[in-house]
């Protein structure tokens, strides 16, 4: 699947829009809001039911080139006594992001979009039971 | 920028770094997986910490829809389906990498653009402040 | 069987105002939590903004926090809402929500439409 064109027809294409070869597309990888920081609730991967460890992929042919995951420490979740409940289960939670791959062919360079799934942390969730007849 | 191993029967001209602007190929590699989360999995309603997703559609950004959650309690889902407000349900954050039309409505001229998106909802034991 | 009733929906313009009020059956001073949770359209009931029993007020995200405000009339029995700078994404069925002795109660709700 391609990049969906504009389909609306008060997007028509402005005089301004930088000359492109076929196939491809002009990507600045300087990002927008790059500075933002994420403000979430003090270590939730901790203090969660269902907590999680993080790890950090690095791949210099990426951008970017650190990518981190979430593992859930458990299969099942953590009970008000602090002790694994098997009853319930502790499941990834994920979100897609892309990512810019180059790729050497040679001495020349190519650069393509890539779709990665990222793990973020877990939930805990009743486990889906199926009865055999 | 990044730096990267270069091959050493290159000319020494090649930037190390990721250039500020690259041309990149339409087509996604493994633009395939499941963008909509309703359908990759029920978490959201069968967790303790249950969420809503809400459609969140930009035409000028790709991809053009994303999905945000919303918890739907405050405190968390317990054995006898009530809310336990000794438990908080949060939302679960994630800095994304999308594009950005730009110039504004040109079909082939991006710029990355990081969002901040709730993926989900996790149930954590709140933090006490106690006062002296 | 404790009951909540839901006034003060209606149809109203962008950046307009309305005030929901709940009427409680019991005592909202006994209550483990009292506040509001809407529906959107095709979506589940979520929490907006909660007062739990130590009197602590809770708003859902943001969005909601500084053009909502919840409150609590201990003597009348009553919860309200005060809405302010609706927006089309307000649109949803408004519920009253209360909790005593470990279990939630909801009422029927209140149809609150945002036109642009």
């Known amino acids: 699947r391609k990049i969906p064109k504009v389909g609306h027809t008060f997007f028509q294409k402005p005089e301004s829009c930088p000359p492109v070869p076929g196939g491809s597309m002009k990507l600045d990888i300087g990002i927008i809001n790059e500075n933002q920081r994420v403000s979430m609730s003090r270590n939730i991967e901790s203090r969660s039911t269902s907590p999680w460890n993080y790890t950090v992929t690095w791949d210099p042919n990426r951008y970017p080139s650190e990518v981190v995951q979430a593992q859930c420490r458990n299969l099942g979740c953590i009970n008000a006594q602090g002790k694994e409940d098997i009853s319930m289960n502790s499941v990834p939670i994920q979100q897609e992001t892309l990512v810019v791959r180059r790729k050497h062919q040679g001495c020349s360079v190519s650069f393509q979009l890539e779709k990665v799934l990222v793990t973020v942390g877990c939930t805990c969730v009743t486990p889906v039971i199926h009865h055999v007849q | 920028g990044i730096t990267i191993p270069r091959n050493p029967g290159c000319p020494n001209s090649e930037d190390k770094n990721f250039p500020r602007t690259v041309m990149v190929n339409l087509n996604i590699h493994n633009r395939n997986t499941n963008t909509n989360p309703k359908r990759s999995s029920d978490y959201y309603n069968r967790s303790t910490s249950p969420w809503n997703l809400h459609r969140n559609e930009d035409p000028e950004r790709y991809p053009s829809v994303i999905w945000e959650a919303k918890c739907r309690h405050l405190g968390c889902i317990n054995a006898d389906g009530n809310v336990d407000y000794h438990m908080n349900s949060v939302p679960i954050q994630q800095e994304i990498l999308v594009l950005r039309r730009e110039p504004p409505h040109c079909p082939n001229s991006f710029r990355l653009e990081k969002i901040l998106v709730s993926v989900g909802c996790t149930c954590v034991t709140p933090i006490v402040h106690h006062v002296a | 069987e404790v009951q909540l009733v839901e006034s003060g929906g209606g149809l109203v313009q962008a950046g307009g105002s309305l005030r929901l009020s709940c009427a409680a059956s019991?005592?909202?001073?006994?209550?483990?939590?009292v506040g509001w949770y809407r529906q959107p359209p095709g979506l589940q009931r979520e929490w907006v903004a909660i007062?739990?029993?130590?009197?602590?007020?809770?708003y859902a995200d943001s969005s909601v926090k500084g053009r909502f405000t919840v409150s609590v009339d201990k003597v009348k029995n009553t919860v309200t809402l005060q809405m302010n700078s609706l927006k089309p994404e307000d649109t949803a069925v408004y519920y009253c929500?209360?909790?005593?002795?470990?279990?939630?109660?909801w009422g029927q709700g209140t149809q609150v439409t945002v036109s642009s």
């Open positions: 007062i739990t029993s130590g009197g602590k007020t809770n």
């Open positions: 929500y209360a909790q005593w002795m470990g279990r939630d109660y």
């Open positions: 019991d005592s909202v001073f006994t209550a483990k939590a």
